[in-house]
């Protein structure tokens, strides 16, 4: 999971200003699946790459989110990007963390956690991020993972990099993370479950 | 509607194993944790752990980890409890619970199992 | 681990009286709180989530308020079938904790 939000947003942070502002007003009249409801106009047209890249999943969820943002690429005429971001929605994910279990490939695939749903607005809003990494040290992160992090130079990479590791992580350990978040930026959480 | 039903009481001696279970109904198992939650006689509320069915992952309750194992069988929708040595201090009603909603974490326990009363005798 | 404290351990009221049950957290738990009702014999029963969101089915006089360490479960005028132990939980870190319990008794 996290995978097609990643593709999403480098997509959306690679357009120019102006085609941004030509994807929202696409978007506001692609046509929907079924029981799939629109951003409203007036929040989507304020939005920047990442936090509308956190509204298209909370809306569509990843694998639609995807599809659905390839569908107005392909609209405005940038095939290669439509074509990049659903190649890149289609890999697999990287090796889990020492001491955390991988789930079974066949397993069903699981719930949105808060962690996926929201990872956009984390990585532009999380500030407290050592606090974070001191507090998965040993039970999510390992050695070298929470050195990676740190070895970021601003807080956007840092989570960035921190959300790397994440496509490996169960459930527990999101709510690990999760935790550390109601624990130092409980404001934030709060937040986030209101959009 | 949402549904958990428990299996029913039990009476063991100690050193016994025992695996109760919680069955549930009326949404998607692998989309939402499920809870053990225990009550000695009397007594107050007590969080056991639980098991997120979507990936099998456990969070426990350091008070009991080791003691008890939380496992779930996606395929026929139902959470177990399990002790593979029974002491008397282990008698108690045990609920399942689910939460309100899972994917953000914030467990409030909307919906509860009828209980089950585990009672270790010699 | 997080104590909650809940007080009183038991409260004595006629129907129709406002009731005020209080819990007490060890630390700051922000809005991360609720509160249950459980009468013997039965399961819990969610009455507020996050401090003072309503449960569904909830009827109007169950109240609650607070945030960070102190919060007030409020029934505003009881009635007879609330007569039960009132229990709070804390859904702020690991382990999830609940507090002792307050007694709800006819007068």
């Known amino acids: 999971m996290g995978r097609a939000r990643d593709a999403i947003l480098d997509a959306l942070e690679n357009l120019t200003a102006e085609e941004l502002k030509k994807f929202k007003l696409k978007l506001l009249s692609v046509p929907l699946r079924e029981g799939y409801g629109r951003i409203p106009r007036g929040a989507l047209l304020s939005m920047d790459a990442l936090d509308l890249t956190d509204k298209l999943v909370s809306f569509y969820l990843e694998t639609y989110g995807a599809e659905l943002t390839a569908n107005v690429l392909r609209d405005m005429g940038l095939q290669e990007m439509a074509g990049q971001l659903q190649a890149a929605t289609h890999q697999g994910s990287g090796a889990a963390p020492a001491g955390i279990q991988a789930p079974p490939q066949s397993a069903a695939k699981p719930g949105l956690h808060f962690i996926d749903q929201h990872r956009a607005a984390l990585i532009a809003r999380v500030t407290n991020v050592e606090w974070l990494l001191d507090a998965l040290y040993g039970k999510v992160l390992t050695d070298e993972q929470y050195q990676a992090v740190r070895a970021e130079p601003t807080n956007p990479s840092k989570m960035r990099k921190l959300f790397s590791f994440t496509p490996a992580w169960n459930w527990t350990c999101k709510d690990l993370l999760l935790q550390a978040l109601r624990e130092s930026q409980s404001y934030l959480v709060e937040d986030l479950e209101r959009s | 509607e949402v549904q958990l039903v428990q299996s029913g009481a039990e009476v063991k001696k100690p050193g016994e194993s025992l695996k109760i279970s919680c069955k549930i109904s009326?949404?998607?198992?692998?989309?939402?944790?499920i809870h053990w939650v225990h009550q000695m006689p009397g007594k107050g509320l007590e969080w056991m752990g639980y098991?997120?069915?979507?990936?099998?992952?456990?969070m426990y309750n350091e008070k009991f980890q080791g003691q008890v194992t939380i496992s779930a069988d996606k395929s026929i929708s139902t959470a177990y409890l399990q002790w593979s040595s029974l002491k008397a201090s282990d008698t108690a009603m045990y609920y399942c619970?689910?939460?309100?909603?899972?994917?953000?974490?914030?467990?409030?326990?909307?919906?509860w199992g009828q209980g089950t009363l585990v009672t270790v005798s010699s | 681990e997080i104590v909650l404290t809940q007080s009183p351990a038991t409260l004595s009221l006629s129907p129709g009286e406002r009731a005020t049950l209080s819990c007490h957290a060890s630390q700051n738990i922000n809005v991360w709180l609720s509160w249950y009702q459980q009468k013997p014999g039965q399961a819990p029963r969610l009455l507020i989530y996050k401090s003072s969101n309503l449960h569904t089915g909830i009827p109007a006089r169950f109240s609650g308020s607070g945030s960070g360490t102190d919060f007030t479960l409020t029934i505003s005028s009881l009635e007879p079938e609330d007569f039960a132990v009132y229990y709070c939980q804390q859904g702020q870190s690991y382990p999830l904790t609940f507090g002792q319990g307050t007694k709800l008794e006819i007068k």
């Open positions: 098991i997120y069915p979507g990936d099998s992952s456990a």
């Open positions: 009326g949404y998607s198992f692998t989309d939402q944790t």
């Open positions: 619970a689910r939460p309100l909603y899972s994917y953000a974490s914030y467990y409030w326990f909307a919906y």
